[in-house]
Each structure stands twice: as C-alpha cells, then as structure tokens.
C-alpha cells in the first residue's frame, strides 16, 4: 500500500534570464528511494539515481544543474521554459510517486527595465 | 524484468588493460543510467564509474579518472568499462548496475572477477 506524499514548491513564477530550484519532498513512507526522474512535459531533463548519481540529458546539460539534493536548477530561463514539470520519485517496495510543478518565467519587470519618468 | 550478464574479467599484469562487457535484458527507458561498481577482498563495495544508456553522460570514481572509460552501445543493450594502466589495487569483482522498472529498484550482476597482478 502506498502511503506517502509528495509536497513540491507548487506554482511559480521566475523572470527570464534568471535561475530557478524545482524541489519535491518525498514524506509519510519508510520506502527507499531508489532514482528520481525529473521531466518536463514528455521530455526528460535528468536522472539522479541513488547508486549511479545525476545524469543530465544532453539537450538540457548546458542549462540544468543537478541538486540541492534531489532538486535541480533551471538556468538562463526563458519563456518557452513555462510550463509544467514532474518530480518522479522511484522507490521500493512502493513504486511510483509523482509531484507537478508549474512554472512561468516572465520577462523582466518594467519597474526594473522600463523608462523612468521624473516629475518636476 | 532487467538481468545483466558481465563478461571480460580476468588476470593481467600491473599496467595492462582489459575491457569489461555487461549485456542487459529487459531493460526499460532508454536514458536509464548504467555503471559498474567493485568489491575487493575484505572490502566495501565502491562505485566506479556510470553512463545513461544515451551515453550523453558519464560519472566516474576519483580513484579510477583517466584510466578507465565507460561506454556504452544502445542498439546492443551492452554497456563497455574499458580499463587501462590497471593497478593491483584494482583487483576486485566488478559488477554492473542499472535501475529496473520493474521492480523499482536498482538491478545487479553477478559480477567479473578482475586480478591484476604480475
């Protein structure tokens, strides 16, 4: 019987250009973990598996960091990096677990780019 | 269900080299990392070195970097350590490891024994 929960960081928001930590949490069950697959949409960005460590897919490397523990690190974001992402928890004897995390990457803020306008 | 069968083991002189084969079955996603692990005599378990079966990549122990290479070849489900300038301190039995699917956990060979020694 499953009995654990995946708690993730939810919805979020990051501005593009910049970086992002995508992090689960795996609680309530004694089961091992034994790898966690990081996916965006059907892509899979990485691997950590408990014996063999982080393996980042080739498309993502130059741009996915792995860590802190089992999160990982979106970086120089964009926005076609918006969108949804799974945490896939593995473990034995229960199986699968699955978090979702949404996340928009937003163009940088006016108040930060835009014209500055001095009233006189 | 993954079963793994290793070959290539055997004795060799300090500073020869030998190439070790793992040949999977029933191996799932293909990105699914892959490696080898060795026990000596009287000794834990050590990770040597891993691949993801895209072979885009690669992990490897300090002890082992820049003497041995691990690859692998997806069409044949067959994963490569190639080891060079081998040591007597790299005697042991390596076994190969990969994560089963199957039962969600990772899966091990029943290992190649490696003597190095003159």
């Known amino acids: 019987m499953m009995t654990g929960t995946i708690e993730t960081t939810g919805n979020i928001s990051a501005e593009k250009g910049g970086s992002i930590i995508l992090q689960c949490h795996l609680s309530s069950t004694t089961a091992q973990v034994t790898q966690v697959n990081w996916e965006q949409q059907d892509q899979l960005l990485a691997i950590c598996n408990a014996d063999l460590g982080w393996h980042i897919s080739p498309s993502f490397k130059d741009r996915v960091a792995p860590g802190p523990g089992l999160g990982l690190t979106l970086q120089s974001l964009t926005v076609n990096d918006t969108g949804e992402y799974f945490c896939i928890y593995h473990t034995y004897p229960d199986g699968t677990y699955t978090g979702r995390i949404f996340l928009e990457v937003l163009e940088s803020s006016v108040a930060e780019h835009g014209a500055r306008f001095q009233i006189p | 269900e993954v079963q793994l069968v290793e070959s290539g083991g055997g004795l060799v002189q300090p500073g020869g080299s030998l190439r070790l084969s793992c040949a999977a079955s029933?191996?799932?996603?293909?990105?699914?990392?892959m490696g080898w692990f060795r026990q000596a005599p009287g000794k834990e378990r050590e990770f040597v070195a891993a691949?993801?079966?895209?072979?885009?990549?690669?992990n490897y122990a300090d002890s082992v970097k820049g003497r041995f290479t691990i690859s692998a070849d997806n069409s044949k489900n067959t994963a490569y350590l190639q080891m060079n300038s081998l040591k007597p301190e790299d005697t042991a039995v390596y076994y190969c490891?990969?994560?089963?699917?199957?039962?969600?956990?990772?899966?091990w060979g029943q290992g190649t024994l490696v003597t190095v020694s003159s």
């Open positions: 029933g191996t799932a996603a293909s990105f699914n990392p």
């Open positions: 490891v990969t994560y089963s699917a199957y039962d969600f956990r990772n899966a």
């Open positions: 691949i993801s079966w895209s072979g885009g990549s690669t």
